[in-house]
Interface confidence: medium
Amino acid sequence: LRPSRVYKPEGNTKRALTLKDILNGTFSYKTYFPNWISEQEYLHQSEDDNIVFYNIETRESYIILSNSTMKSVNATDYGLSPDRQFVYLESDYSKLWRYSYTATYYIYDLQNGEFVRGYELPRPIQYLCWSPVGSKLAYVYQNNIYLKQRPGDPPFQITYTGRENRIFNGIPDWVYEEEMLATKYALWWSPDGKFLAYVEFNDSDIPIIAYSYYGDGQYPRTINIPYPKAGAKNPVVRVFIVDTTYPHHVGPMEVPVPEMIASSDYYFSWLTWVSSERVCLQWLKRVQNVSVLSICDFREDWHAWECPKNQEHVEESRTGWAGGFFVSTPAFSQDATSYYKIFSDKDGYKHIHYIKDTVENAIQITSGKWEAIYIFRVTQDSLFYSSNEFEGYPGRRNIYRISIGNSPPSKKCVTCHLRKERCQYYTASFSYKAKYYALVCYGPGLPISTLHDGRTDQEIQVLEENKELENSLRNIQLPKVEIKKLKDGGLTFWYKMILPPQFDRSKKYPLLIQVYGGPCSQSVKSVFAVNWITYLASKEGIVIALVDGRGTAFQGDKFLHAVYRKLGVYEVEDQLTAVRKFIEMGFIDEERIAIWGWSYGGYVSSLALASGTGLFKCGIAVAPVSSWEYYASIYSERFMGLPTKDDNLEHYKNSTVMARAEYFRNVDYLLIHGTADDNVHFQNSAQIAKALVNAQVDFQAMWYSDQNHGISSGRSQNHLYTHMTHFLKQCFSLSD
């Protein structure tokens, strides 16, 4: 028997992190995103739940809605009408899927200082929003869309087709919510509030995933979700636009689908209003390498939306799928015709292009062996975007301004030199025309949020600097974090290594690989975090490594598309390559190497453990995918094609975890899954377990009853991380 090892951080002044610290969220940080209501005004919910109004220019601030009003209806969120006469208050939040939830809504009249009575909103509501002008309300109730011209008016029913699990109006079904829109809504107001565009999803022919929810009753209930798995029938989508001024005169008008899209199965991918009578729709073929952006105009003469073919712009990938994780959306110029969009250049790097007439004639705005990530705002004279250009680190994000008014356009990095050590990963929040903006820095140091002048980029004030967190971390021994790259053959892999306090290169440490590795993901980011792996390094003396292998994002299409049609090959191979390189560094105990991952990471960790290399002693898979045939059509097919004989069925079969059951014989494997996982169904782990049992391979398993993909209920989460900690410490012979 190997003697148990106890890691004792040296020095007495500071203490190590405990698992309790992590589970209690003791060291969580705050960010500050202004809720912009004009060019220079915003709202923010204070610590004590007052809704406070701020004017940057007059320095005025006052409570617009008191915490007592919020508390009177147990409100947890709010929304101010654009005419500033009303506020909706949201309560009874009830989570559904990743983004969707239902809630009860109350309308508060700011003028009268009382709640609007009469024609009160039904409950629970699936989605509610104000028009961009005035105080019209659109809401979705029982899968149908309703309109109120004013909060106290009777509602007008726009759609009648809504039916639970069958037809969804104005809200996405499961697969569109998770894999395409990444929102809880599928309706969009025109800028002047005249038109309301919405999507109808028809799920009538989609197979149902059914699972038990045990609850407390004598009998479990069954959850049924229309969920298209790879190769199955997909939702049928239609886009409609209704004139909200006269909704009863002219019914919803259907927007045509581009011919080259409509000729076979297709998806709707996004809608962008360009002007009050111009809308831009994006469509995608089911084989997701062709995307079409279609600009449509309202024809007053025959009350319809026309989408001429010369206003169709095609984006096609010849090496993989179109776009990154999602197809990018356009940022239109003031002329309401030309737009800026991120897509791959001839070298396969995602960059900003300016499209005036055709995609073929697009003018490339940014270029280089790095990627533009997101366009925040286009104004008359400036374009603000984020990229990972600075100093060549793919895991950083800086905000840049291109002065498009100048000829040639000039580029300036707004954030690169602000707080260079503390801040290397930014996002931003802009007022309507970018007169002011907030910068939110996520690390690698303590997060900080600041307010800036949109013309000069001058910092106006610090909004949140996490002083309390800074103080509470003073007596904590935090691990050291390094972000570096390693080379293997012609490939470069970025990695993040979390080293125990008082790390000594001459000693040997156990190694835990944390992996996600999904297409277009990124794990090696310059962000601040105090989480489970921070604790493992701080208290248990474990070296943690995260590696971005092939298939991960923001390093060009050659690297990204390497995994196209062959998931489960290079992601695993690259983790193994990295482990071998880490062993060569000399401070890793080869006998004590583990790997763990969640979701896609559970898939990769399972395949890595079953690689037959003997590199890993043990590993954990939480809620793993085990076969791409079990996962959602939009996701699986984007990267794998169809599971048909004449397409890619062979690799669908070869890439399952079950196919490698025999190879788990020489590793300790902990398999964990929530039974109410709507996303990666429990079926995935059930099939792994069945294959391991059939192969007579011993393994450990834990299920979490009625828990979803996040296993996030307080008690389940505590149990999960405690259980995984015990498993790892046992594997690494660390005493409790």
Partner: antibody, heavy 120, light 109 residues
Amino acid sequence: EVQLLESGGGLVQPGGSLRLSCAASGFTFSSYAMSWVRQAPGKGLEWVSAISGSGGSTYYADSVKGRFTISRDNSKNTLYLQMNSLRAEDTAVYYCAKTHSTSWYYFDYWGRGTLVTVSS
Amino acid sequence: EIVLTQSPGTLSLSPGERATLSCRASQSVSSSYLAWYQQKPGQAPRLLIYGASSRATGIPDRFSGSGSGTDFTLTISRLEPEDFAVYYCQQYGSSPRYTFGQGTKVDIK
């Protein structure tokens, strides 16, 4: 196999009414916009009316606007054309036509037509 | 509204000959949203060409379409006996406001 079968034509006096039907089969009816196209004896083709797949949007040629009403019953896979205040110039063979997609595109399938004669 | 003018009104040709039918639009047809149909006496029209140049399913390759903007052409490379019929062009660029040409009759010389 896609099939469109019109019915309801016949002889009617000026000012009278008729309701044409088109029974569709062989495709997912609700997923396609449909149209009525007519052809007066010895003349060319004239588009009359169109309706979206859901029935939410309807369109008419100026010559029939206010007199004709297009509708559909997706549960019965049937398209209709209600013709009121009929005139002599409405005399024609009326064809029901399926568009190629959900949207307003070319007609990939046509019915055989039904003859409407408006005469006193 | 877009007016389509077909020429000639009648085309008299022999089997084996090449037929060239013209369709001119009063204004530009959005991105080649133009279709050609064939109609034989007592029958419904049949789709031949869509998108100005794409052949519909089951249409022989002797039929071809070309053109863009305002000028479009339907060509039958070698007339077969069954090709003698009336041919209509149709624009669907401003659809659902469809318009048809007045037709070109191809008859046997």
